[in-house]
């Protein structure tokens, strides 16, 4: 059956934890992505940012997991109003910021 939202969010958090803990060389060769506003709709915004990183196996699972939280199909080059335009950060920092925010949501019981 379908995975409960709390389980899906926990699994996404655990995957981001795994990425941050196992990071040896610069994540995705130091690729830069658009920063996003961590507000409503941020799952799609996060996916829109990360989907523009290609050839980085470390975040492929995260990209797939985020697509499960985003109700519409996301493709490379697509940008929503949730991006902080003109502000790019390294993928590693993006992941850390997203991880902290998702933990906060998880602990507040906001699973969707």
């Amino acid at each position: 059956g379908p995975v409960p939202p709390s389980t899906a969010l926990r699994e996404l958090i655990e995957e981001l934890v795994n990425i941050t803990q196992n990071q040896k060389a610069p994540l995705c060769n130091g690729s830069m992505v658009w920063s996003i506003n961590l507000t409503a709709g941020m799952y799609c915004a996060a996916l829109e940012s990360l989907i523009n990183v290609s050839g980085c196996s470390a975040i492929e699972k995260t990209q797939r997991m985020l697509s499960g939280f985003c109700p519409h199909k996301v493709s490379a080059g697509q940008f929503s109003s949730l991006h902080v335009r003109d502000t790019k950060i390294e993928v590693a920092q993006f992941v850390k910021d997203l991880l902290l925010h998702l933990k906060k949501l998880f602990r507040e019981g906001q699973f969707n």
Epitope: I13, V17, T20, R107
Partner: nanobody
């Protein structure tokens, strides 16, 4: 929501020992630290010791060699074995769950604290 429950505090003579326990109910992620802080009357809360999921331990200089922190990941419990206690160790001891600060500092100076316990009183008489 995680709850932290401390136990093991009490009154002890200088040179004696106590073992504090802190049991956490709820989810603690593997990158998070569990640790102990203390606050003496009229003083600021200060770091005592911390431990991560992998068992790496960190101590304040004032307790090194006397206190030992350990963690049972299966039980989500952290312990603080306090030996050779001194009157200056008298304080309320608090358990905490926290993220290391952005530069990875495990001492919680700039950490993101998720949870604090209610505290347990340790009094060391001379």
């Amino acid at each position: 929501q995680v709850q932290l429950q401390e136990s093991g505090g009490g009154l002890v003579q200088a040179g004696g020992s106590l073992r504090l326990s802190c049991a956490a109910s709820g989810t603690i992620f593997v990158d998070e630290f569990m640790g102990w802080y203390r606050q003496a009357p009229g003083k600021e809360r200060e770091f005592v010791a911390s431990i991560n999921d992998g068992g790496s331990t960190y101590y304040a200089d004032s307790v090194k060699g006397r206190f030992t922190i350990s963690r049972d990941n299966a039980k989500n419990t952290v312990y603080l074995q306090m030996n050779s206690l001194k009157p200056e160790d008298t304080a309320v001891y608090y358990c905490a769950v926290f993220e290391p600060s952005p530069d990875g500092d495990p001492f919680g100076d700039r950490a993101w604290f998720w949870y604090w316990g209610q505290g347990t009183q340790v009094t060391v008489s001379s």
